[in-house]
Every structure is written in C-alpha cells, then in structure tokens.
C-alpha cells in the first residue's frame, strides 16, 4: 500500500511536471478580471464613459481557447482525484500574488473550484486552496 | 464615493519620527490591499509601501526598508505609515492610494506633507 | 524593474495626436497573459488619476481619445486629439514585481 502511495506520488509529480497549467491560469484570470471600476467608480468622474468596453464583454475567442487547451491538459488528471487537487493547489499558487484585493481572491477560487465541472471532468472532493507559503490573508 | 484622507505630516528634523494616518470611507476597507506613494517637491511619483487585506503580507521599496513600517487598523478602516530616521530625501507629499484589487492603483487619497529639515 | 519614459517634456498643438513611450528592463507579461503595466495623468495640483491598466483597458470615465498599447517590455500611450485638459504629467507604473514608476512626461499645449 506505502510502495503503491509513493508510486502514484511519484506519478503525479512527473504529470505536474509534464502539464502546462498556463492556458488554466490565463482563463482564469480572464474570467474574473471585469473592468476593476465595477467594483467602485473612480471619483475623478460621476459616470461611465459610454466608450468603456463593457465589463461583461471580456470573455472572447481567447478565452475559450484558453479553457479548451486547460481542459485538455486537466484531463490528464482524471483519474487521479489527489493530483488533480494538487494541479489546482498550483494554479492558486501561481496566482495568488496577482489577487489584491479578498473578493478577487475568494472569486478567483470559486472559479477553481468549478473548473474540473466546466470541464466535464469529476471535481476533488476535498481540496484545500489556502496557498501557505508567501502568508496569504485569513480570516 | 470612495474617500481617502491622509493626515499626520508635517516638518520633522532628520532622524526624527511621524506617524502619517489615512482614513477611508465609502468601500469596504478591509476588502483591499492598500498603497503608500510619495512625491518630492517638483519631482515623480515614487511607490513608497503596500499592506494586503488583512495585513499579513508587506511590500517596501527599497529606499525605505528598515526604516518604514505600514500598517493598517481594519476596524477603524485606517491606513499607518510609521516612518523612522528620516532624511532630508523623505522630504515628499504622501499619497495613500486603494488596490483596485489586481495590483492597480484605483483611488488616490489627495496627499499630506511631510517636511524633513534641520 | 527600471521604467524609461519618453519623452520627458511633450509640447503639442491642441487637437493634435500625442504619443509618450514607456519602455522596462524586462518584461512585464505575467505567465496569465496580462501585461502589468498602467497609466497616469498628474494635473498641476492634483492627485494622480488612473487612465489605462494592464497596459490597454481604459479606466471607467477616460475619454476614448486615450488608448494604450503595446507588450512585454514596450508600451505607448497615445491622445487622439489633445485637448487643452490633457496638461500635466503622465507616468507608466509596472505592477509585475511589487510597483514602480517610470520618471513622468510632461505634455503642455501650445
């Protein structure tokens, strides 16, 4: 049972490794990064330039293609429920430092969570995205 | 309407202390990473400190490591920039700023002015 | 990272275009495909103002005349049409690695 627990370690590690998690990451983020000026309006000017690109037109062509190349690379996890948390675990990692602010963060893994779904792929049951190293904020 | 109001600056001789405060309104303060930035007299913009959130995380230029310190009181939704051994190259107007929450600096305070000199 | 703007003083006849070059020491393309880089307008007086973020998506109540370009380590600000409120200093700022600002542009109409 140990040998087998090192093995599909040792597995999981070259298919992390071998992954490129990247398409993941940028659908991601494209995903949650709506024009940041929904959150609060800035106080130089009372209204919305009506040339301002919608906040919910930020979903393009590239986008999908990037979820069609993360899904191709998650499915590589398919069968292993701990890897494929671990593979979420490092796109949160990679991540983290670029979310300023609780909501983007806490959106950031709502979508996470859910990729694996959107994917048509099974989700870990139990996966912990709380990214340890670099301290973030708890509360 | 997002407000930020910095206060606590003043003259100051080199070496000495001060505590500049901002006070925040109009969002939820303890939502965001928040940002010191400076200016000297006739010069450019200069990104002093950052504190995340809930405060775990600190960023400081180099120029002030060791000798600033940023906090920040979540409950009073206040920001704190405690700046030691200060020298005349401090000398600035002290911005605090808001994170849009994606590293970008979204909501300038209007500034405090802090003067070093003997 | 070292931000180099140009150029440092910008004279430009109203209603004319304007174009201020920002340039790192390296580049500023996170692996999410964003490049951190983002624009400000200083007016005499006043606070900085946010024009552009990750380097072309125009700030909620900036005229359209304001676009940003560009990726990796070279980045243009462009004014359409400079309009006699456009005065002031304009800075690029990264946000890749912690932040910093590039020295400013002074633009003055003629």
């Known amino acids: 049972r140990q040998q087998w627990e090192l093995q599909g370690d040792r597995r999981c590690q070259s298919q992390l490794e071998r992954a490129n998690l990247r398409p993941c990451e940028q659908h991601l983020m494209q995903k949650i990064q709506r024009d940041e000026d929904s959150y609060g309006r800035d106080p130089y000017s009372p209204s919305q330039d009506p040339y301002s690109p919608s906040p919910y037109d930020r979903r393009g062509a590239g986008s999908s293609q990037h979820q069609e190349r993360c899904c191709n690379e998650l499915n590589e996890f398919e069968n292993n429920q701990r890897c494929m948390c671990e593979a979420l675990q490092q796109i949160m990692e990679n991540q983290s430092d670029r979310l300023q602010g609780r909501q983007q963060e806490q959106q950031f893994k709502r979508e996470l969570r859910n990729l694996p779904q959107q994917c048509g792929l099974r989700a870990p049951q139990r996966c912990d995205l709380e990214v340890e190293s670099g301290g973030r904020d708890r509360y | 309407e997002v407000q930020l109001v910095e206060t606590g600056g003043g003259l100051v001789q080199p070496g000495g202390s001060l505590r500049l405060s901002c006070a925040a309104s109009?969002?939820?303060?303890?939502?965001?990473?928040m940002h010191w930035v400076r200016q000297a007299p006739g010069k450019g913009l200069e990104w002093v400190s950052a504190?995340?959130?809930?405060?775990?995380?600190?960023y400081y230029a180099d120029s002030v490591k060791g000798r600033f310190t940023i906090s920040r009181d979540n409950s009073k939704d206040t920001l704190y920039l405690h700046m030691n051994s200060l020298r005349a190259e401090d000398t600035a107007v002290y911005y605090c700023?808001?994170?849009?929450?994606?590293?970008?600096?979204?909501?300038w305070g209007q500034g405090t002015l802090v003067t070093v000199s003997s | 990272i070292v931000l180099t703007q140009s150029p440092l003083s910008l004279p430009v006849t109203l209603g004319q275009p304007a174009s201020i070059s920002c340039r790192s020491s390296?580049?500023?393309?996170?692996?999410?495909?964003?490049?951190?880089l983002d624009w400000f307008h200083q007016r005499p007086g006043q606070s900085p103002r946010r024009l552009i973020y990750?380097?072309?998506k125009r700030a909620s109540g900036v005229p359209d005349r304001f676009s940003g370009s560009g990726s990796g380590t070279d980045f243009t600000l462009k004014i359409s049409r400079v309009d006699a409120e456009d005065v002031g200093v304009y800075y690029c700022m990264q946000a890749l690695q912690t932040w910093t600002f590039g020295q400013g542009t002074k633009l003055t109409v003629l």
């Open positions: 990750m380097a072309s």
């Open positions: 504190i995340s959130y809930g405060g775990t995380n600190k």
């Open positions: 390296q580049s500023l393309v996170h692996r999410n495909g964003y490049n951190y």
């Open positions: 700023a808001r994170d849009s929450g994606y590293r970008s600096l979204l909501h």
């Open positions: 109009g969002f939820a303060f303890n939502d965001y990473t």
